[in-house]
Every structure is written in C-alpha cells, then in structure tokens.
Interface confidence: medium
C-alpha cells in the first residue's frame, strides 16, 4: 500500500465558514460531550465547563467555573508543581449521568475530585467526591473514561506520581479495579474506552463489554530499548469480582496486541493515538478505527487501521493465552501457554452456558479460573486489521484524533469517511477509493497551528458537524464545503460522497442536508467529469494594460493534485520564455507588455483521476495592451503609479470549455513558482493619473463577446 497522497484541496482558516468558541483566559478545551436531543455541546476546559448551542457553538448558553483555592494551589506548589499551570483544575471527565446532570472530574491541583453538575441550574452540587482512580492527578497524564448505566469506567493513574496505573469501575454496589501488577498494566498510556452492548437478539445471554485502548511497555518483546505495544483490553459489565481470589478486582480483564503494520515494508505502527467506534445500522458488528504512529517517528508517519470488533472478541473468546516463565538470572520471558485451560474459560463473561453450569456470577467462579486469569491477562493471539493492512498511511504529518462517518453516495455505495486531525491544527477528510486513499480536503481549523486535542462527530441528520477542541478553543466545521466547488467539474473531481452537482441551480450541494429527492443530481465518485453538462457560457475577464508594463492574470485552481498551464491564442505558453512567469504556482505574469500580447489567455488544469486525465478551463482572460498617450494633467491633479500598469478590468460572458492541451507549457510544478525576470524599468507611460479611464472612452462600451469553443475531448 502506497502512502496517501496530499489532500486534493487545502482550505485556509479564513476561506471557509468555521464557527469558533473560546473564552478569555480559559485554556485546554479537551473534554467534549454532545447532547444531540438538546442540540447542546458541553465543553470541559481548564477550571470551567460550558454549554453552547451545538448548531452554532459561538452561542454560549451556560458556564460554570471550578477553580482551585489558593490554599490548594500552594500545597500543590510545595510538592514541586507549577502554580501557574499544573496546580489548576483541568476537567478530564465529562460524562452523562441523567437528562439533568453530568458527572465531572478534574485534576484539582493534583488532588483529583469529582462532582455532579446540575444542567438546569448549571451549578455543581458540591459533592466533592475523591476523584482518585477516576481522573489523573497530573494534567499531563493519560486518561480515558466512559459512563455505562450510571457507573464510571476509567483508565488512569492512581497516585500522585502517576506510577500506579488502574482500570476501574466506580460503582456503589460493585466497585472493581485491575491488579497492580506489570502483567496487567505496564506503564500504559490510556487512549479510549467505550461500551459495546450485546446484540438484543443474542442467543447466549451474553454480557455487555467495556473496551479499553492504550499503549503500554511490552512484556513479550525484549530489546535494548523499551518497546511500546498498542493494546485492546476488555472487561465484562456484569463482572462482580471474585469471592476470595481477585476480590474487588476484575475477573474478566483480558488484553491483546493490536496489529497495524505495512507488511511489505516492515513499517510497524505501535503507538496508539486515538480510537473511534463506528456504529451504523448497516453494520452487524461495530468497526473500530485506530490511529497510530511509529515509536521512532522522526519522519512524521501516521496510519489508520480498521478492525472488526468480532475479531477482537474471537481472540478473547477462543485465543491462546501468554504466560511468563523465569529463565536464567531470574529474567522473565513471555511465551505462548499451551497447557490445559480451566473451565469456565478464564476471563470469559458470564453467559447462558456458564449460568447453566451454576456459575450465575463471577463471585461463583472457581479459584482455578480466577487464579489463571490473574496470571494470564495477556492473549498470545493478536487482533489484526480488516484486509490485514492499514486503511491509510500518511507521511509528513502527525495525526492526533480520528472520527469516522459512514455515508452513502448517490449510487448507493457506502463510504467510511475518516476525519483525522493533525498536530498543526488541521483536519484531513479521507476515503478509500478502490484500494487507494483519496484525501478529499484539508481544513485549517486553528489559525495558530496548535494540536487538535479532541474530535467529536455529530450524527443528527440534517445538521452534521465535526467539533474540534484544542488548547485555545473549540471549532465547529461542517462535514463538507460543497458550496465552495464553483463548477460541476470541481464538484465531481472533489470525489466527496457528501457533495453532488445540482444542474437546475448550478451549485454543488450537500447531499444529506436536504430532504429533497436526489433525482437529477450529479455525483461521480470515480471523478469522471465528462458526466457534467456542457457549458455554453461562462465568464471571462477583459483587462486593459499599458504598453511596457507587467500583467498578472489570476487562475484560482484549488486542487493540489492539478497541474496548471496557460494557453495564449490556443498555443501553449513555454516555461522557458523570459516573457512569462508563474506567481504562486498558478497566476500568470506577462512581462514587458506589447500589442502582440493582446488576445485570449486561458488557464487550464490537468488532473489525473485514476487512469484518465481531466482537463478544465479554469479561467479565461482577454488582454488588450494600450499605448496610452500622455494626457494633459491639470496642475491640481494628483498623479499615481498603478501597480502592474493596469488600466481596467471588466468581466464578460464567454464559453469556458477547454481545448486539448498539446506540449509542456508555463506550468506549476511541485517545486513552486518559476523564477521571474527582473521588472522592466518604468517608462514614461507608466505614470498615469487616476482619470486615465476618461482618456480611453471605448472602455465604457457594453460589448458582449463570445469565445468559440475548441473542445475536442
């Protein structure tokens, strides 16, 4: 599998409509929770929680502050922590409790605390519960949590130093935790947790499962340096711990290695960055997408692998276990366990079969089973990705977060659209197209190029957004910028499953925003723009420049995958000519203008889509070079130099169908603009008064010109 190409389009922050939320002096907007029923987005930041309108996040509905007392700050600082940054309250848990309350935990100056937030009054209830094991002490430490039926499942560190990792369930009737032992958790960096509900029609009375994803230091691979391993672990929701062995500890904790590698090149992605569980009506079993980087990432590599949850469950239900053996110098080595496995199966959830054998709860499990799972929490079998390869590998980028949306194109094909954020504040939107990856676009969400810390996807039909949180604020972006594609060709070439061309309105529209039927809309995910209707008319610009000056003709081709070249009077302009240059890889510069430069200039783009080359006329300019006589200037009139010696521009209607390009031209290359010749020295005619238009009366003529099409595609 090749590296993913560059994004086809790059939207700068100011180019597209992005809605922002940030409050003065509030930072670290890293916890996001969406209530789609209420159209409210809850935001947990440093020392504050906000409720904003999910349809327009710049509209703040409520705010509440949870600050650390000066006394607590001082105590924290005494322990060697920074009073200005670390000894504050970073909201790390923001989970739903009921329609009117949230469960909120914060680092609270290295004394983690939790409270209930009443959503009606938007005030904390002042419960001030101990947050140990639910929330990290240190804002820099990893954490994850999920609320399942009123009980908080967390992965974090249990002490001030962050040296004791824990996966726990905070429950009034059955609190549970992991063993504090290296085989269970070895310096984990927690990434994500979620509950997977049993299927309603499941015949074997199986239990809901809570999955945890993290990277930890390997126990099974030994090298000179510490090898990191991405893990998937799971516990059963019905687990109540053991009666004697594993009392108040998980009896169902099992973990396995996640594989994400490129077999042909030996590229192994072993640091897990983020996980997204894709649930869709069309999916019998959820698919989870995991985002990785390699351990030694000096080149900026990132990969996305997708996994069927059933593959993971198969490993836990039927896979082999690993066991530690002591070799010379009391050195521990982990190998596959081939001995007998006790019954009921260690780590298994209590199902109908177990109940039939009178094991109605984990409290009834025999010591043999419990002792085995205590000593063998690691599976020997690994969880392999769908198609045994990554969905996407990208170099020169560090991806930070991922969300995925399953959507249907006009032809009925289903696409998993990956929205992946970067450590430079951008969002990439990518799909798999016939075993290749197409990065539809890159959007610069944050102007300051800061890392995206959290991503959230709304699933409400009609109003679909991605929300991104960073240190400085939250940004709301639509799933697609269809309206920015001005022509049918642009709309089709975007190969965006959310967008289609509407011939009646001559606009690129978002498919799922409208309830109206999709009849007559044009979408071609192959990028075949020949499906677009012929355009008999389009605009071109008419410019008047003066003799000896320099003209800049604009060409706004947004595609990064397109090569731009220019034609003059249907001949392709040569790159070598000292007469021409390219500005910003697209705009044409014509130096030392003379009457011979008057005529029609066309900017064409050439884009390879699959095995076809698509040519488009992006812009047409009619240039007229005038010899402007020196006017008689009244003494009071101010005289200015007009940049580029331009006289005027007007827009007229013309055909914009392309003609086939022959040989190489003045064209943009990946290396950037062509070197420009020096600007010609100003001549006497380059000093023009502002009233120069009055000296060229024909500028006011209302002539409409049509340019003949010479399209022979």
């Amino acid at each position: 599998m090749a590296f993913a190409p560059i994004p086809r389009i790059t939207w700068e922050h100011r180019e597209v409509h992005l809605v922002q939320f940030h409050e003065p002096d509030i930072y670290n907007y890293s916890a996001l929770l969406l209530s789609e029923d209420k159209d409210t987005l809850y935001i947990g930041a440093r020392e504050a929680v906000f409720a904003v309108n999910a349809l327009n996040i710049s509209e703040k509905q409520h705010e509440v502050y949870w600050k650390v007392s000066e006394d607590k700050k001082a105590k924290c600082a005494e322990k060697g922590k920074s009073k200005q940054t670390e000894c504050l309250n970073y909201i790390r848990v923001l989970q739903p409790l009921s329609a009117t309350s949230l469960y909120v935990c914060g680092t609270n100056a290295f004394q983690p605390a939790c409270d209930h937030l009443n959503l009606t009054s938007f005030k904390f209830l002042g419960k001030n519960e101990d947050g140990k094991g639910r929330c990290p002490f240190d804002p820099a430490h990893s954490y994850t949590s999920v609320m399942v039926d009123g009980e908080l499942y967390s992965g974090t560190s249990y002490n001030f130093l962050g040296s004791e990792p824990i996966i726990s369930r905070n429950s009034s009737h059955s609190p549970l935790r992991t063993e504090y032992a290296i085989p269970w958790l070895n310096e984990p960096s927690f990434v994500f947790a979620d509950v997977i509900r049993k299927s309603p029609d499941s015949p074997d009375g199986e239990d809901d499962r809570v999955y945890f994803f993290f990277t930890e230091v390997s126990v099974e691979y030994e090298f000179v340096f510490r090898v990191l391993i991405p893990r998937i672990a799971r516990v059963c929701k019905g687990d109540q711990g053991g009666l004697r062995t594993l009392q108040k500890k998980w009896t169902s904790f099992l973990k396995a290695r996640l594989i994400c590698s490129r077999p042909d090149s030996g590229l192994v992605f072993n640091v897990l960055r983020d996980v997204f569980v894709l649930r869709s009506p069309g999916l019998k079993v959820p698919v989870f997408y995991a985002l990785f980087t390699p351990q030694l990432n000096n080149v900026g590599l990132s990969a996305v692998c997708a996994y069927n949850l059933s593959t993971a469950e198969e490993v836990f239900s039927h896979g082999k276990y690993m066991q530690s053996t002591t070799v010379e110098q009391s050195h521990t080595k982990w190998v596959r366990y081939n001995g007998p496995v006790p019954k009921p199966r260690p780590g298994a959830c209590i199902d109908s079969e177990a109940r039939a054998a009178n094991y109605t709860s984990s409290l009834n499990l025999p010591d043999k089973t419990l002792q085995f799972v205590k000593d063998h929490p690691l599976m020997d079998d690994s969880v392999t990705p769908i198609d045994n390869r990554p969905r996407l590998i990208k170099k020169d980028v560090n991806y930070t977060q991922i969300v995925v949306d399953r959507t249907q194109a006009l032809d009925g094909t289903v696409y998993d659209v990956m929205f992946v954020s970067t450590d430079r504040g951008a969002l990439h939107k990518a799909i798999s197209l016939e075993h290749a990856v197409h990065i539809i676009e890159e959007t610069q969400l944050f102007q300051d190029f800061e890392p995206v810390q959290t991503l959230l996807l709304s699933s409400k039909k009609g109003n679909r957004f991605v929300y991104a949180g960073s240190n400085s604020g939250v940004v709301q972006a639509p799933l697609a910028f269809c309206g920015k594609h001005g022509t049918c060709e642009d709309c089709v070439l975007a190969r965006d499953p959310y967008c289609a061309w509407s011939p009646p309105t001559a606009t690129c529209v978002a498919l799922h925003q409208t309830e109206s039927p999709s009849r007559g809309l044009i979408q071609e995910m192959s990028g075949d723009a020949s499906v677009c209707p012929d355009k008999s008319k389009g605009s071109y610009r008419q410019h008047f420049f003066k003799h000896g000056g320099t003209a800049e003709l604009k060409c706004s081709q947004k595609s990064n995958l397109a090569r731009v070249f220019w034609k003059f009077q249907n001949g392709v302009l040569k790159a070598e000519s000292p007469k021409y240059g390219l500005m910003g890889r697209k705009n044409l510069l014509i130096f030392n203008l003379s009457e011979g430069d008057s005529g029609v200039y066309q900017c064409l783009s050439e884009e390879r889509v699959k095995n076809k080359t698509v040519f488009q006329v992006v812009a047409k300019h009619v240039l007229e070079v005038k010899v402007v006589p020196k006017p008689v200037v009244a003494p009071t009139l101010s005289v200015v130099q007009t940049e580029g010696s331009r006289i005027a521009t007007k827009v007229l209607v013309a055909s914009t169908q392309g003609s086939s390009p022959p040989t190489p031209a003045v064209q943009a290359t990946s290396s950037g603009a062509i070197t420009l010749p020096p600007k010609p020295a100003p001549t006497g005619t380059s000093c023009e008064p502002k009233i120069v238009i009055n000296t060229v009366p024909q500028l006011h003529s209302e002539k409409t010109m049509y340019l003949k099409s010479s399209d022979n595609r």
Partner: antibody, heavy 122, light 106 residues
Framework: DVKLVESGEDLVKPGGSLKVSCAAS????????MSWVRQTPEKRLEWVAY????????YYADSVKGRFTISRDNARNTLYLQMTSLRSEDTAMYFC???????????????WGQGTSLTVSS | DIVMTQSHKFMSASVGDRVSITCKAS??????VAWYQQKPGQSPKLLIY???TRHTGVPDRFTGSGSGTDFTLTINNVQSEDLADYFC????????FGGGTKLEIK
C-alpha cells in the same frame, strides 16, 4: 413540581381511532424524552412508544407498530398518541411518562401522569 | 423480548418487618433495572433505577440490589403506607415489566 396530565377517558369501537394528549408542566419539556406506557385491566404494565426530546427518534412496541403514532409539540409542552385500528387488547389505562436519562432512550420513567382510560369494545 | 419474572404475586408483612421482593430477568441485563411502587388508585412511582440508585425523595428504607439476572427490592421497617403493588422493569433493551408483587400489611 413535575406534572403530566393526560386527556379524558374514552370508549371506542374496534377498528376505531383516538388521539390522546398529555400536557406537561413544572419542567423544561423540550429537554426530556417521553414515553407512553399502558396498564391492562389485569394490572400488567406494557411500554407502548418512545419519542426523543427533539422528536428525531421514535420507537414503538411490536404490538402497536403501524397502528399508533407518537408525536410532541414542544412549543405547547404536549405529548400525543394517535391510535388507529384499535383492538380489544388495546383496552388499558394509558400513562404519559418522562425518561430522565441524558441521551434519552434510557427507557425508565421518573414521572407518570394520572393516566387516561381507553376501552375498546363494540 | 426480555422477560422479567416476579415469582411472588403476593407477599405479606407486619409493620416493622423487613421484606424482600425478587425479580429475575430471562437474560443478563447488567444493572439496567428499575423498581416502581403503585398504590391503589394511583399511577406508578419510581423508587429505584440502575438496580440500586434511589430516586429523589424515596425513603432510605427502600434498597435495590443485584445485577445480571437476579434483582431484589428490600423494604426495611415496613410501614402501613407501603401497601402497594411493586413492579420491576428492565431497560437494557426495549423496556419490559415484571408482573408485579402485591404487598399486604398484616
């Protein structure tokens, strides 16, 4: 104080139709998912239908699917149940209930109306 | 559908007694169980949700326990006003109710 008040009782012939309503007060109606639950003359409770706070998500019990329609008017703080093709087994006390879970779809009910009695008989 | 079975249709207790009403689910429902009290001529009232969490205003004489398939509602120090029908309900899937247990006061 949370109050749910259903419309008056009725006697309907089999095959007939009826629309019952529930007026909510004492809480922000638009923030809560709502359900209809019925109780048969034998005192058996049966969940009938669910609607999310914004009205985007609607679910029905198999026994009423295709015959009953749940709807809400958040501006009027009112929940409705339109019942058609009524059968004798639909005879019950119909309760309007509130679902207090964060995401809705919690399907447990923290407040119940006083109920409206429906008798389907010829 | 998940079937909720309350094996005792009737139970009787004297004032001050402790009584345990049981409910069994046909499959594992985790902790997604609620208990309701319905006094004669009234609509049901929520007592317990998430198997063991008391609803606002419910006296602490009422306690819920259990998880998976077996659930119990315990009433300590039974009072005369506790005369009522008690229903369990699962909400792991579309909600279903138990048949009810009538508590009579001797």
């Amino acid at each position: 104080d949370v109050k749910l008040v259903e419309s008056g009782e009725d006697l309907v012939k089999p095959g007939g139709s009826l629309k019952v309503s529930c007026a909510a007060s004492g809480f922000t109606f638009r923030d809560y998912a709502m359900s209809w639950v019925r109780q048969t003359p034998e005192k058996r409770l049966e969940w009938v239908a669910y609607i999310s706070s914004g009205g985007d998500y609607i679910y029905y019990a198999d026994s009423v699917k295709g015959r009953f329609t749940i709807s809400r008017d958040n501006a009027r703080n009112t929940l409705y149940l339109q019942m058609t093709s009524l059968r004798s087994e639909d005879t019950a006390m119909y309760f309007c209930t509130r679902d207090p879970s964060f995401y809705g779809r919690g399907y447990y009910f923290d407040y119940w109306g006083q109920g409206t009695s429906l008798t389907v008989s010829s | 559908d998940i079937v909720m079975t309350q094996s005792h249709k009737f139970m009787s207790a004297s004032v001050g007694d402790r009584v345990s009403i049981t409910c069994k689910a046909s499959q594992d429902v985790g902790a997604t169980v609620a208990w309701y009290q319905q006094k004669p001529g009234q609509s049901p009232k929520l007592l317990i949700y998430w198997a063991s969490t008391r609803h606002t205003g419910v006296p602490d004489r009422f306690t819920g326990s259990g998880s998976g398939t077996d659930f119990t509602l315990t009433i300590n120090n039974v009072q005369s006003e506790d005369l009522a029908d008690y229903f369990c309900q699962q909400y792991s899937n579309y909600p279903t109710f138990g048949g009810g247990t009538k508590l009579e006061i001797k």
